[in-house]
Interface confidence: low
C-alpha cells in the first residue's frame, strides 16, 4: 500500500494509526475536503432545527428551522421566532408596530412609512402596521384632466426590504 496521506479524498481521513492510509469517515462524520487528519462530527438538527439535507461522508448536514421560526446567521446557525406581519420581535417577544411604522414580513423590524411629501407627493392610500403608504401624484398634478392616480409600484420580492 502506498502512502496516500497527502491525497486522501473527501469522505476519508488520513489515519496515522494505520500507516497513513485513507480511512473512510465513520458513521455520523464527514470530511468535505481531501487530505484531512480527522473527520468532523455531523451537525445534528434538533430542537427548533430540522434537517434540510442529511449528512454524508463528504458533506455536513444542513438545518432549517421548524414552522414558526426562521433562520439567522451563516448556515442557519440560529433560529429566531416568527412574528406576524405588523409586528417585530423584541426581547419581550412579538410586539405590534408603533404608529407610523410597518412590517410586511414575519421577520425583521418595523420600518417607518414612506414620507410622500419629501417627493412632493400626496398620500393616496394610508399606511397600516402591515403595509407602507401608497404615494399618489403631487397636489399640483390633480388639476382637471390630470390622471387621478399613478400605477401601483411593483410588488417587492418576498424577503427583500425596501432600499
Amino acid at each position: 500500500l502506498q502512502d496516500l496521506c497527502s491525497n486522501c479524498p473527501a469522505g476519508t481521513f488520513c489515519d496515522n494509526n494505520r500507516s497513513q492510509i485513507c480511512s473512510p469517515c465513520p458513521p455520523n462524520s464527514f470530511s468535505s475536503a481531501g487530505g484531512q487528519r480527522t473527520c468532523d462530527i455531523c451537525r445534528q438538527c434538533k430542537g427548533v432545527f430540522k434537517t434540510r439535507k442529511e449528512c454524508s461522508s463528504t458533506s455536513n448536514a444542513e438545518c432549517d428551522c421548524i414552522s414558526g421560526y426562521h433562520c439567522l446567521g451563516a448556515e442557519c446557525s440560529m433560529c429566531e421566532q416568527d412574528c406576524k406581519q405588523g409586528q417585530e420581535l423584541t426581547k419581550k417577544g412579538c410586539k405590534d408596530c408603533c404608529f407610523g411604522t410597518f412590517n410586511d414580513q414575519k421577520r425583521g423590524i418595523c420600518r417607518p412609512w414612506t414620507n410622500c411629501s419629501l417627493d412632493g407627493k400626496s398620500v393616496l392610500v394610508n399606511g397600516t402596521k402591515e403595509r407602507d403608504v401608497v404615494c399618489g401624484p403631487s397636489p399640483a398634478d390633480l388639476s382637471p384632466g390630470a390622471s387621478s392616480a399613478t400605477p401601483p409600484a411593483p410588488a417587492r420580492e418576498p424577503g427583500h426590504s425596501p432600499q
Epitope: 500500500l1 496516500l4 486522501c8 479524498p9 473527501a10 469522505g11 476519508t12 492510509i21 485513507c22 480511512s23 473512510p24 458513521p27 468535505s32 475536503a33 481531501g34 439535507k53 454524508s56 461522508s57 463528504t58 458533506s59
Partner: antibody, heavy 116, light 107 residues
Framework: DVQLQESGPGLVKPSQSLSLTCTVT?????????WNWIRQFPGNRLEWMGY???????SYNPSLKSRISITRDTSKNQFFLQLNSVTTEDTATYFC?????????WGQGTSVTVSS | DIVMTQSHKFMSTSEGDRVSITCKAS??????VAWYQQKPGQSPKLLIY???TRHTGVPDRFRGSGSGTDYTLTISSVQAEDLALYFC?????????FGGGTKLEIK
C-alpha cells in the same frame, strides 16, 4: 430517481485514448457524493478506476494513475473518463456509479473493445 | 492493495435453502465491506454495506456479517430470482477492491 448513463465508442484502437461520458439525471453532481468509473473485465473481475467528487477533487486507482483522467461538465451534469495509451487489456464493460460510503447507483454499462 | 478473496467461484443450491457466500480480506478492513448482486446483462446492485447494513429495498432474507478479515453474505431462503453473481468489496482502503465473484446457481 437518480439515473446514470454511460456513452462512448465501442471500439478503440490500441495506443489511442478511450473517452467515455456519464450523464447523470435526478441529482446534481455538484451537490454531494463522488462520481466513479468502474470496469468489469471478461471473466467478471471488477476494478475501481477512480472518481471525481462533488467538489471537483479526484482520486484514482494507483494502477492507472499515469493513464487516467476524470473530469466533469457541471452545466450538463456529466462526468468523463479518459484512459490513454490503451491496450487489449483495457477491453471491458465500463460502468459509472455514485459513491457515498459505497456504490449505491450504477449505470447500465458500456462495452469497449480495444482492437486494431 | 487489499486483496478480497471469494474462495467459491460457483455455488449450487436449491430454492428454499440457506446459503452462505464468504469473502476474506488480505488484512483487517474494519467491517467496511459491501456486497453486490449482479444478474446477467445488468449492472451490479448494492445489497449490504458496513458488513451488515442492508441497502434500501433489499429483502431481509439477505444478511451480512463478519469483522476483521472474514465476511459472509447469507441468503436465508434462496429464491429463483437470486440466481446471480455476488461480489464483495472493501471500502476501507483506497484503491477500493472487489472479490472475484461467486456465481449462485439454482439446482
Amino acid at each position: 430517481d437518480v439515473q446514470l448513463q454511460e456513452s462512448g465508442p465501442g471500439l478503440v484502437k490500441p495506443s489511442q485514448s478511450l473517452s467515455l461520458t456519464c450523464t447523470v439525471t435526478g441529482y446534481s453532481i455538484t451537490s454531494d457524493y463522488a462520481w466513479n468509473w468502474i470496469r468489469q473485465f471478461p471473466g467478471n473481475r471488477l476494478e475501481w478506476m477512480g472518481y471525481i467528487s462533488y467538489s471537483g477533487s479526484t482520486s484514482y486507482n494507483p494502477s492507472l494513475k499515469s493513464r487516467i483522467s476524470i473530469t466533469r461538465d457541471t452545466s450538463k451534469n456529466q462526468f468523463f473518463l479518459q484512459l490513454n495509451s490503451v491496450t487489449t487489456e483495457d477491453t471491458a464493460t465500463y460502468f459509472c456509479a455514485r459513491w457515498g460510503y459505497v456504490l449505491d447507483y450504477w449505470g447500465q454499462g458500456t462495452s469497449v473493445t480495444v482492437s486494431s | 492493495d487489499i486483496v478480497m478473496t471469494q474462495s467459491h467461484k460457483f455455488m449450487s443450491t436449491s430454492e428454499g435453502d440457506r446459503v452462505s457466500i464468504t469473502c476474506k480480506a488480505s488484512q483487517d478492513v474494519s467491517t467496511a465491506v459491501a456486497w453486490y448482486q449482479q444478474k446477467p446483462g445488468q449492472s451490479p446492485k448494492l445489497l449490504i454495506y458496513w458488513a451488515s447494513t442492508r441497502h434500501t429495498g433489499v429483502p431481509d432474507r439477505f444478511r451480512g456479517s463478519g469483522s476483521g478479515t472474514d465476511y459472509t453474505l447469507t441468503i436465508s431462503s434462496v429464491q429463483a430470482e437470486d440466481l446471480a453473481l455476488y461480489f464483495c468489496q472493501q471500502h476501507y482502503f483506497t484503491p477500493y477492491t472487489f472479490g472475484g465473484g461467486t456465481k449462485l446457481e439454482i439446482k
